[in-house]
């Protein structure tokens, strides 16, 4: 059957933890991505931002996991209105910001 939202979110959090704590060199060679609003629809927005990073094996699993949270297909170059299109940040900071937001959602019991 389908994976419960809380389990899927836990797995995503644990993957993001792995990424943030296992950095031995700049994540994705210091690639920059669009910052996003961490609000409703953030999973699709996060995927839209990260999918533009190619050739970075460290975040491939995260990209796959985010696609499971996003109801529509996302492809490179696609952007929604959820992006703060004037701000680019390093992938490492993007991942840490996303991780913190997801941890807070989990603390509040908001799994969906």
């Amino acid at each position: 059957g389908p994976v419960p939202p809380s389990t899927a979110l836990r797995e995503l959090i644990e993957e993001l933890v792995n990424i943030t704590q296992n950095q031995k060199a700049p994540l994705c060679n210091g690639s920059m991505v669009w910052s996003i609003n961490l609000t409703a629809g953030m999973y699709c927005a996060a995927l839209e931002s990260l999918i533009n990073v190619s050739g970075c094996s460290a975040i491939e699993k995260t990209q796959r996991m985010l696609s499971g949270f996003c109801p529509h297909k996302v492809s490179a170059g696609q952007f929604s209105s959820l992006h703060v299109r004037d701000t680019k940040i390093e992938v490492a900071q993007f991942v840490k910001d996303l991780l913190l937001h997801l941890k807070k959602l989990f603390r509040e019991g908001r799994f969906n």
């Epitope: 836990r10 959090i13 943030t20 490492a92 840490k96 913190l100 989990f106 603390r107």
Partner: antibody, heavy 122, light 108 residues
Framework: QVELVESGGGLVQPGGSLRLSCAAS????????INWVRQAPGKGLEWVSG????????LYADSVKGRFTISRDNSKNTLYLQMNSLRAEDTAVYYC???????????????WGQGTLVTVSS | SYELTQPPSVSVAPGQTARISCSGD??????VSWYQQKPGQAPVLVIY???DRPSGIPERFSGSNSGNTATLTISGTQAEDEADYYC??????????FGGGTKLTVLG
């Protein structure tokens, strides 16, 4: 308000055993990771052990692994630490400390009890 | 195992800014908490998730964390801020880990 009250400390001989308890109130006990942290006299903080909200995960510092056992009874809102084969270096104030959330990645303490002193000496 | 390093002591004049550092390998990849401990008392959380303040903690306390160093900043330090301060974080290998502590002295 969040309250954590430790008990069970005292004087014990090397090689002896002691069981600490921590009574929790003021929050939903079964939704949080809980830790034991100790502080030797005049020294810094040392994390000892922690347990997930549902007891599904228990973790220990290398210094106590195999000698200490953490457990919890969510029906009684109580945390325990069974300490066996005690050594002089285990002498410390033992604090019960709630984690920020339910899981290991949120185990960093937010609220602390006042502590209970364990003295291991002959 | 993961280690956090703090200066043993920091001194500051009343009303000035105190900065306490906490260094560790890629500490910026973790979330740092800061605890205040006064003699004979239990630690009190003053900063968590790098720069969030629990309710009841004065705005003069703030935190930052990037690279290999996290910093606790106390702006307009008051006499009542004199205490030991510990940084702490969670690491996948060591689990909860604390720095050795920094004694903050408010001069005068």
């Amino acid at each position: 308000q969040v309250e954590l009250v430790e008990s069970g400390g005292g004087l014990v001989q090397p090689g002896g055993s002691l069981r600490l308890s921590c009574a929790a109130s003021g929050f939903t006990f079964n939704s949080y990771w809980i830790n034991w942290v100790r502080q030797a006299p005049g020294k810094g903080l040392e994390w000892v052990s922690g347990i997930a909200y549902d007891s599904s995960n228990t973790l220990y510092a290398d210094s106590v692994k195999g000698r200490f056992t953490i457990s919890r009874d969510n029906s009684k809102n109580t945390l325990y630490l069974q300490m066996n084969s005690l050594r002089a270096e285990d002498t410390a104030v033992y604090y019960c400390a709630r984690g920020l959330g339910a899981f290991h990645w949120d185990m960093q303490p937010d609220y602390w009890g006042q502590g209970t002193l364990v003295t291991v000496s002959s | 195992s993961y280690e956090l390093t703090q200066p043993p002591s920091v001194s500051v004049a009343p009303g000035q800014t105190a900065r306490i550092s906490c260094s560790g390998d890629n500490i910026g990849g973790t979330f740092v908490s800061w605890y205040q401990q006064k003699p004979g008392q239990a630690p009190v959380l003053v900063i968590y998730d790098d720069n969030d303040r629990p309710s009841g903690i004065p705005e003069r306390f703030s935190g930052s964390n990037s690279g290999n160093t996290a910093t606790l900043t106390i702006s307009g330090t008051q006499a009542e801020d004199e205490a030991d301060y510990y940084c702490g974080t969670w690491d996948m290998v060591t689990n909860n880990v604390f720095g050795g502590g920094t004694k903050l002295t408010v001069l005068g």
